[in-house]
């Protein structure tokens, strides 16, 4: 049994770490295998991860976690039986990837103009919390080439855009992801979508 | 809210013994490694002893070492400091503190007088 | 003798800002992450900062920790008469199996 591609990880600078790679053949990740991790600090004591399938011969394992702080850096051990496969570390600082928004609503009664919201993945106490940005992704369900992407690199997770510069009449979909600068993360998954259908007044043509 | 109640100080001859506890609340103690501190009057805080969250690993100030020793009982949430041959040197207020990366929560200490 | 080195003392007028220093020795390992403790008068220690510069929740703003090297620094801006205190630095020292404290600065708040 032999590992064909190097666990990597990633954290989401919270609670949880997630780790995955690939066996060299089909493998029972849960009852074959166990991922050991363990904080490089003189009281801190080894964890044992029981990863599931990720596909046939790949494997993936969520590390939890108290919190993470930049300094942290862990040492993982991944076993078969009494057989170390692999022996790495993982600081959990520099493979970001934050947690995907959520709650994302559509207000469509501000005369003419659409807000959307969302809420930040993260407590405030939580470094992360006040160094996010996002981009918001609309597109139309009739039309697959209207799609667009907005950045919010303010700190607010809130956009508004005025309803005229969608098509009227017609349903809407959206969604939100985050990154972070600060620690140049990789973006989050996508936040579920929602929608909603546009409508509003056209202005009357002056003759 | 966590926590922590230390118990058993008091008068003591030099050469003596006493035992200090430590009653854990509000957290899950088997979880996060724990630690002694104490503070002589008037003087600095002055580390003494830590173990791992299962008593795997324990280490000790080399003023201590050999004359102390530290257990918990996870079943019970309780840290303990066992203190023989006891010196005026040792005469403190001692702290019981949980560990995380630092020591984040202190009891309110118990105080040690080794005198004759 | 401590390995980390802090001023006895330090002051300040309320509304300041006071920045109290904390070193290691030239062969104090700089591996380790600093923590910094506040005791008021007649109480227990308690956690100010932890890992060089994170704050514990409840701890306000006006505390800020940083490190470069094997020194450390706990800076308080807007001083209050509150802040009248005992403030220990400490790391972990895997060379010692240990952790290490600073023999502590105090602070007054004139005025």
């Known amino acids: 049994m032999k590992v064909l591609q190097e666990p990597t990880c990633v954290s989401d600078y919270m609670s949880i770490s997630t780790c995955e790679w690939k066996m060299n053949g089909p493998t029972n990740c849960s009852t074959e295998l166990r991922l050991l991790y363990q904080l490089v600090f003189l009281l801190s004591e080894a964890h044992t991860c029981i990863p599931e399938n990720n596909g046939g011969a790949g494997c993936v394992c969520h590390l939890l976690m108290d919190d993470v702080v930049s300094a942290d850096n862990y040492t993982l051990d991944l076993w078969a039986g009494q057989q170390l496969l692999w022996k790495g570390s993982f600081k959990p600082s520099e493979h970001v990837k934050p947690r995907a928004p959520g709650n994302l609503t559509v207000h469509t009664n501000v005369s003419d103009t659409l807000l959307l919201t969302w809420s930040n993945p993260y407590p405030p106490d939580n470094y992360l919390y006040n160094h996010l940005t996002y981009a918001v992704n609309i597109w139309s369900e009739n039309d697959p080439a209207d799609f667009r992407i907005y950045n919010v690199t303010y700190l607010e997770p809130s956009l508004r855009i005025a309803a005229s510069t969608l098509k009227s009449g017609i349903s809407y979909r959206a969604r939100v992801r985050a990154w972070a600068q600060c620690y140049n993360t990789t973006w989050s998954e996508w936040s579920p979508s929602t929608k909603w259908h546009n409508s509003y007044r056209e202005p009357f043509e002056q003759h | 809210e966590v926590q922590l109640l230390e118990s058993g100080g008091g008068l003591v001859q030099p050469g003596g013994s006493l035992r200090l506890s430590c009653a854990a609340s509000?957290?899950?103690?088997?979880?996060?490694?724990m630690a002694w501190v104490r503070q002589a009057p008037g003087k600095c805080l002055e580390w003494v002893s830590a173990?791992?969250?299962?008593?795997?690993?324990?280490y000790y100030a080399d003023s201590v070492k050999g004359r102390f020793t530290i257990s918990r009982d996870n079943s019970k949430n309780t840290l303990y400091l066992q203190m023989n041959s006891l010196r005026a040197e040792d005469t403190a207020v001692y702290y019981c503190?949980?560990?995380?990366?630092?020591?984040?929560?202190w009891g309110q200490g118990t105080l040690v007088t080794v005198s004759s | 003798q401590s390995v980390l080195t802090q001023p006895p003392s330090a002051s300040g007028t309320p509304g300041q800002r006071v920045t109290i220093s904390c070193s290691g020795s030239?062969?104090?390992?700089?591996?380790?992450?600093f923590n910094w403790y506040q005791q008021l008068p007649g109480t227990a220690p308690k956690l100010l900062i932890y890992?060089?510069?994170h704050r514990p929740s409840g701890v306000p703003d006006r505390f800020s920790g940083s490190k470069s090297g094997t020194s450390a620094s706990l800076a308080i801006s807007g001083l209050r008469s509150e802040d009248e205190a005992d403030y220990y630095c400490?790391?972990?020292?895997?060379?010692?199996?240990?952790?290490?404290l600073g023999c502590g600065t105090k602070l007054t708040v004139l005025g």
């Open positions: 503190a949980r560990v995380h990366r630092a020591f984040d929560y």
């Open positions: 509000g957290f899950t103690f088997s979880r996060h490694a």
């Open positions: 173990i791992t969250s299962s008593g795997r690993s324990i």
């Open positions: 030239p062969l104090f390992p700089d591996s380790g992450s």
């Open positions: 890992a060089d510069s």
């Open positions: 400490g790391t972990w020292d895997y060379s010692l199996s240990g952790y290490v």
